[in-house]
Structure formats: structure tokens, C-alpha cells
Amino acid sequence: MAVTACQGLGFVVSLIGIAGIIAATCMDQWSTQDLYNNPVTAVFNYQGLWRSCVRESSGFTECRGYFTLLGLPAMLQAVRALMIVGIVLGAIGLLVSIFALKCIRIGSMEDSAKANMTLTSGIMFIVSGLCAIAGVSVFANMLVTNFWMSTANMYTGMGGMVQTVQTRYTFGAALFVGWVAGGLTLIGGVMMCIACRGLAPEETNYKAVSYHASGHSVAYKPGGFKASTGFGSNTKNKKTYDGGAHTEDELQSYPSKHDYV
């Protein structure tokens, strides 16, 4: 029972984590304008991995995609790569772990096969989580470096008569989503690996010993012992999961010039 629970929980936690990694990767708020120096700006800038946006007080938001590949910083490319690798590994891991779930019966799949699949998916989740955490951390480090560089420029270039407000960027919501999601995927992966140990049958088959005494032949053939899971080998615990989680992408409609009531 404990193994099934651990495996199921690991799957759910990983699923939430991967959903979070996908969400973080798609989010535009990886870096947001630091308002400390100019808290009353009428124009708010924020940037994602794929595009940069400007939100005006008017309610209009303009986003521009990074349509170049060669012109982008290597670090940004690296972050993109890490996040995508994390998503791909996580998605494959989810696919593998679905078939590995103890509560799902597929043909005559043996527990040893399920154990191997659970371990594989667990490792995939761990690597996926680490990729996401690494990607977010690299981006955060990039922000910190740029933040202090622009702060230095701000205070060294104040000799002129005309003030130029330097736009500094700080951590956006996507970073925190990414860190949490990566952590969840990692935890889910560890749980899957733990569950794998409980699923693997510990084969302790003793060689059959025959005793020939006074014409009677007795053969002892003890069966292999299975690690106790709380369920007999013939007992199958079937559960039906109703996928009730529906995600709706709320498309925020921005005003048009003539928005009639």
C-alpha cells in the first residue's frame, strides 16, 4: 500500500511540477522592471524567454517576440535549452510513469518491469527538475549581474544636466514559479525512485534439494519471497482516476480604439 501511495504521489507531484515548468517557460514575467528608482512610472516593462512586453497605464500591452536567434545572448539561449530539455524529459517521464503505476494494469506486465519503468521515470523527473532549477538560476544570476551593472552606470553617469532613467530589471514571477516547479518535479522523481525499491521483487529462490530416504522422494521447492506490499500477488488494486483538472487559458482582451458597449 505504502509503495502504491508513494508512487502515485510521486506521479502527481511530478505532474504538477512539469505543468509548472511549462507555465514558467511560457510566462512573460521572467524579469520585471525594478520600480525602486521610479515607482511612479506610467510605462511598465517586463521580459520573458520568448518576448518582451510593455504595459501602459492606458491598459494597452505591447509584446514583441525575439525573432532573431543569432542576436540573442548565449545565456538566454542556454536558459531556453535547459527549460525545453526539462519539459521534454518531464513529458517522457510522465508517459513512462503512467505505464509504471501499480494501480494501472497493462496486460501481463511484471512487477520487475514496472519497477524499472518507475526508476527510469524517477530519474527523468530528477533530471527534468534539475534542468528547470538550473535554467531559472542561470537567468536569475544574469539578472543580478545586469542589475548591479546598471546600478553602477546609474551612479557614475550622473554628471550630465539631463537625467536618463535607466531601466533596471528584477526577478519576475516566472522565476519563482520555475524554482517551485523544478523542486516539485525533483521531489516527485525522488519519490518515484523510492517507490521503485518497493516494487522490485527481491528474488531469493533457493535451489531445490531432493532427499531420497527409504524409497520416499520429497522435493522442497520454496517459491521466491516477495517484498510485502500489503497486497497478495493475486490481488489487484484498481483505481479509476477522474481527470477533473481542466486548464483554461484566459485570453485577456485588450482594448481596441472603438470598443462599443
Partner: antibody, heavy 118, light 113 residues
């Protein structure tokens, strides 16, 4: 057709209060940032206050901060400016305007006159 | 606060003449996020509310004649009327739309000779 109609302007004594209204038609008020701008007797334009789309943030000029309050009633499609502790320097023509691209005001009302005098 | 300085305060012109008026800000109005200047030009005729002419320093509002041109970047901006018409006689205001308070210039009054 987009229309903004201000009302509520009056002659008021110093220290008094007044509530200006700006009835909007032809667009959904909640989806746009809105501003109040006043024009003093010497014809200078002075920005008074802004409420951004969604109505989360409000901004005020230093001269009215703490005395004026901008709000909106989305159900009535109306913008308000609650003015209190009025001073003689608040005497002006008050305009409400809709914010467009670049935070520019693309539509203005005809204005409502506020006179603060004893 | 960003201070907006308009010059000249008044201009006397003849119909058909090319007119240029200036607007300077104490701080840059250029937003690095979209490389746009948050400066707006308004026209106000007597007894009327101001009318939007130019936003983002150089983008003409729909319905505004193409004789009106906005230019400039950072702190120096210009409104040019290529051939002044009688209906252009008004006061022209520039406004900072980048940072609160959204300050206006004192205006440039366009008059006929």
C-alpha cells in the same frame, strides 16, 4: 460613438467638497485607463489624477494628493473625482479623458467648471 | 518631476508657412523596453477641450492631417506644421506620458499675422 460627459462642477467655498462625475458611453470604462486634467484660468493644463485600467493603481499630482480621490463605477460606466478641502487654486475647468496608446488622452469631455471662492 | 519646456510661447505666422515648435523635457522620455518616446502633442482651440494630435512623439492620431509631424527623441521634441492653415490657429501643448506626474508644457500659441 465614444463620448465623455462631465458634471458636478459648481461654486464652492474654500475648505468645501465637491464630487465630479464623468459619464462614459461608446466603450467599456473598466478596460481603459482614465485621467482627470484641469485647465486653470491662465490656460495652463495640469494633470490631476489617473486610474489605470482594471482600477488597481491610482496616481495624483502633488498639489491634490490627500485631498482628491479618483474612482470608477464600472456598472454605471462612470468615472468620479471626489474633491475635499478645496482651495482657491483648485479653481479650474476639469476635464476627464480616456487613455489611449502611449498614455495619450484620445477622447476628452467638454469639461465642468469648478470655482472655489468665498 | 519631469519639467516640460515649450518654445516659443507664441508664434505669428502667415497661411501656407512652415512652422516648427519645440518641447524639451528635463528627463529622457524614451522607454528602453519598446524604444518609444512617451511624448504627446495636443491642439486646443478656444472654447474647446484639447485634441490629440501626436502620441509616442511621432505617431499621428487617426484623422489628423498629414501636415502635422512629430519628431525627436529622448529630451528634445519638435512639432512641425508643413503648411499652416487658418484652422490650425490654436494653442499646442506637449505632455510627458512616461512618468507620473504627467506634466504638460506651458503651450505654444499659434497666431495669424
Amino acid at each position: 460613438e465614444v463620448q465623455l460627459v462631465e458634471s458636478g462642477g459648481d461654486l464652492v467655498q474654500p475648505g468645501g467638497s465637491l464630487k465630479l462625475s464623468c459619464a462614459a458611453s461608446g466603450f467599456t470604462l473598466s478596460r481603459y485607463g482614465m485621467s482627470w486634467v484641469r485647465q486653470t484660468p491662465d490656460k495652463r493644463l495640469e494633470w490631476v489624477s489617473t486610474i489605470i485600467s482594471g482600477g488597481i493603481n491610482t496616481y495624483y499630482s502633488d498639489s491634490v494628493k490627500g485631498r482628491f480621490s479618483i474612482s470608477r463605477d464600472n456598472a454605471r460606466n462612470t468615472l468620479y473625482l471626489q474633491m475635499s478641502s478645496l482651495k482657491s487654486e483648485d479653481t479650474a475647468m476639469y476635464y476627464c479623458g480616456r487613455l489611449y496608446y502611449g498614455n495619450a488622452m484620445d477622447y476628452w469631455g467638454q469639461g465642468t467648471a469648478v470655482t472655489v471662492s468665498s | 518631476d519631469i519639467v516640460m519646456t515649450q518654445s516659443p510661447s507664441s508664434l505669428t505666422v502667415t497661411a501656407g508657412e512652415k512652422v516648427t515648435m519645440s518641447c524639451k523635457s528635463s528627463q529622457s522620455l524614451l522607454n528602453s523596453g519598446n524604444q518609444k518616446n512617451y511624448l504627446t502633442w495636443y491642439q486646443q482651440k478656444p472654447g474647446q477641450p484639447p485634441k490629440l494630435l501626436i502620441y509616442w512623439a511621432s505617431t499621428r492620431e487617426s484623422g489628423v492631417p498629414d501636415r502635422f509631424t512629430g519628431s525627436g527623441s529622448g529630451t528634445h521634441f519638435t512639432l512641425t506644421i508643413s503648411s499652416v492653415q487658418a484652422e490650425d490657429l490654436a494653442v499646442y501643448y506637449c505632455q510627458n506620458d512616461y512618468s507620473y506626474p504627467l506634466t504638460f508644457g506651458a503651450g505654444t500659441k499659434l497666431e495669424l499675422k
